[in-house]
C-alpha cells in the first residue's frame, strides 16, 4: 500500500474503507506529450537489436492501449547491416501501473495493477556456460 | 479520458463529478512479481549500452520510488572492451502513469499523472548530418 | 538444449474444459514470445494464440476467442493453453512453440486433443 | 486477415531434381522500416513436429543445408529445394506472422 501522512483540508474517508479505496481525479496531469512510441523516437529502427511495436487494446484497462517491444532479431545488427549471432538481442522490461475495471465494465471503479511490460532491446554479451 | 460503458451493480457516481474522479482500490494485483530492477536482470551491465540504475524518491507520489537509467557512456561499448564513439548510447523512455497525491500530503485523494522515464539504454546507428 | 515438452491432453467432451501446459528448458523464457499451433488429423497448421514474453499482452485469431485462454509463468517457464467449450473442430495436435522472433524456432513434440461424447 | 496461399498442393520428385514451391500472400509482407519480409518455410515430416528452414523469406536457419533456399519479395515467395534427397520428402508450410500468424494449406513433396 501507500504510506498516507494525514492531512486537514483533504477529502473525508471512512477508516473501515482507508487506505484501500481512493479517490483518483482522472484528468491526467501530463508532464509529458503523450503520442505513439514509434513517433517519439526512431530508436527502434537505428538501435544493433531493433523491435517492432505491437498494440495490445484491453477496454477493460486505463490505458486501454499498450505497446509491447518484441526484439527483431535473436542476434544484433552490425555495421555492415549483417545479424551477429554471438551477441544477443533482449528485451527490456518495465513494471507499469495501470487502472483496472473492477467489477468489470464498471465505468467509475479501479483497482490498481502492476504489469510487465517490454519497453525496447538492447544488445547483450550472452552467458556462456561452460560445460565441465 | 476512458471510454465508460455503464454497468448496474457498480458503485455509484454522481454526475457532476463524473467521471473525472473515480474509486480506486490500492490493494495492487501484481501479475508479476516486483523487484529492484537491478535484480531482475544484468543486462543493465552486459548491454553494448550499459546504464546505471537511479533512484528517484518522492512520498507525495505512488509509486514513490522509480528508477532511472542514466547511459554510461556516449558510445556503445565493443567486443574488447572499448568504447565505439561511431556508435550512440542512447536511453529508451517510456511514459508511465503514476498517483500523484491531490491536495499535497493527502491520504485518499490522488490525482493521474504521466511522467516519461528512462528504463534502459540501446546502442544506435549516430544520424549524420551532412553540411552543404 | 532447447526443449518444450507439452501434456495435458486427451479425451474431452464437448462443452468441457481441458488446460495444456508447456514446460521449456535450455533458453531464457521471460525473453521470448510464445504460440500455440494446431494441426487436426490430416489438415495443415493453424495458428491458436500468442503471449508476449511478459505475459502482458495476448492475441488470438477469431476461432477460438472468448474460448481459449494463453498464458505463461515465467517463473516456472511454463506455457499454459485454457480451453473452454470445446467443440468437435477443436480436436488436433496442439504444439507449443518459441518465437524466435517473427517465426516459430523451436516446436514441443506436440500432445493430442480429441473432442468427442 | 492475410492469405496464404501455396502452389502447387503436391509434388512428385525424383532424388536430385530441382524443386519448387510458391506462396502467394494477399498483402505485402515487406515492412519499408524494417526492411524484411515477414516469411518463413517450415518442413514437416511424417509423424514429426514441423521444423522451422527459413526465416525472414531467405535466412537460412542454423543447421539446415544449403539445399535449400528461400526468395522472393512483398506477396510472391519461393522455396527452391536444389538437388532433392529422399530425407528432403515432407510437407512444406509457408507462415506469415507480425501481430497474428497465418499459414499456407501446404505442399506434400512425394516420391515419383
Known amino acids: 500500500g501507500i504510506a498516507i501522512p494525514r492531512n486537514s483540508g483533504c477529502p473525508n474517508s471512512e477508516d473501515k474503507n482507508f487506505p484501500r479505496t481512493v479517490m483518483v481525479n482522472l484528468n491526467i496531469h501530463n508532464r509529458n506529450t503523450s503520442t505513439n512510441p514509434k513517433r517519439s523516437s526512431d530508436y527502434y529502427n537505428r538501435s544493433t537489436s531493433p523491435w517492432n511495436l505491437h498494440r495490445n487494446e484491453d477496454p477493460e484497462r486505463y490505458p486501454s492501449v499498450i505497446w509491447e517491444a518484441k526484439c527483431r532479431h535473436l542476434g544484433c545488427v552490425k555495421a555492415d547491416g549483417n545479424v551477429d549471432y554471438h551477441m544477443n538481442s533482449v528485451p527490456i522490461q518495465q513494471e507499469i501501473l495501470v487502472l483496472r475495471r473492477e467489477p468489470r465494465h464498471c465505468p467509475n471503479s479501479f483497482r490498481l495493477e502492476k504489469i510487465l511490460v517490454s519497453v525496447g532491446c538492447t544488445c547483450v554479451t550472452p552467458i556462456v556456460h561452460h560445460v565441465a | 479520458g476512458i471510454a465508460i460503458p455503464r454497468n448496474s451493480g457498480c458503485p455509484n457516481s454522481e454526475d457532476k463529478n463524473f467521471p473525472r474522479t473515480v474509486m480506486v482500490n490500492l490493494n495492487i494485483h501484481n501479475r508479476n512479481t516486483s523487484t529492484n530492477p537491478k535484480r531482475s536482470s544484468d543486462y543493465y551491465n552486459r548491454s553494448t549500452s550499459p546504464w546505471n540504475l537511479h533512484r528517484n524518491e518522492d512520498p507525495e507520489r505512488y509509486p514513490s520510488v522509480i528508477w532511472e537509467a542514466k547511459c554510461r557512456h556516449l558510445g556503445c561499448v565493443k567486443a574488447d572492451g572499448n568504447v565505439d564513439y561511431h556508435m550512440n548510447s542512447v536511453p529508451i523512455q517510456q511514459e508511465i502513469l503514476v498517483l500523484r497525491r491531490e491536495p499535497r500530503h493527502c491520504p485518499n485523494s490522488f490525482r493521474l499523472e504521466k511522467i516519461l522515464v528512462s528504463v534502459g539504454c540501446t546502442c544506435v546507428t549516430p544520424i549524420v548530418h551532412h553540411v552543404a | 538444449e532447447v526443449q518444450l515438452v507439452e501434456s495435458g491432453g486427451g479425451l474431452v467432451q464437448p462443452g468441457r474444459s481441458q488446460k495444456l501446459s508447456c514446460v521449456v528448458s535450455?533458453?531464457?523464457?521471460?525473453?521470448?514470445?510464445m504460440t500455440w499451433i494446431r494441426q487436426a488429423p490430416g489438415k495443415g497448421l493453424e495458428w491458436v494464440a500468442s503471449?508476449?514474453?511478459?505475459?502482458?499482452?495476448?492475441y488470438y485469431p477469431a476461432s477460438v476467442k472468448g474460448r481459449f485462454t494463453i498464458s505463461r509463468d515465467n517463473a516456472k517457464s511454463t506455457l499454459y493453453l485454457q480451453m473452454n467449450s470445446l467443440r468437435s473442430e477443436d480436436t488436433a495436435t496442439y504444439y507449443c512453440?518459441?518465437?524466435?522472433?517473427?517465426?516459430?524456432?523451436?516446436w514441443g513434440q506436440g500432445v493430442m486433443v480429441t473432442v468427442s461424447s | 486477415d492475410i492469405v496464404m496461399t501455396q502452389s502447387p498442393s503436391s509434388l512428385a520428385v525424383s532424388p536430385g531434381e530441382t524443386v519448387t514451391i510458391n506462396c502467394k500472400s494477399s498483402?505485402?509482407?515487406?515492412?519499408?522500416?524494417?526492411?524484411?519480409?515477414?516469411l518463413a518455410w517450415y518442413q514437416q515430416k511424417p509423424g514429426q513436429s514441423p521444423k522451422l528452414l527459413i526465416y525472414y523469406a531467405s535466412t537460412r536457419q542454423s543447421g539446415v543445408p544449403d539445399r535449400f533456399i528461400g526468395s522472393g519479395s512483398g506477396t510472391d515467395f519461393t522455396l527452391t529445394i536444389s538437388g532433392v534427397q529422399a530425407e528432403d520428402l515432407a510437407v512444406y508450410y509457408c507462415h506469415h506472422h507480425y501481430d497474428s500468424h497465418t499459414f499456407g494449406a501446404g505442399t506434400k513433396l512425394e516420391l515419383k
Open positions: 535450455g533458453f531464457t523464457f521471460n525473453n521470448y514470445w
Open positions: 503471449v508476449s514474453n511478459t505475459g502482458s499482452s495476448t
Open positions: 512453440t518459441r518465437e524466435g522472433a517473427y517465426y516459430l524456432d523451436y
Open positions: 498483402q505485402s509482407l515487406f515492412w519499408s522500416e524494417s526492411h524484411m519480409n515477414y
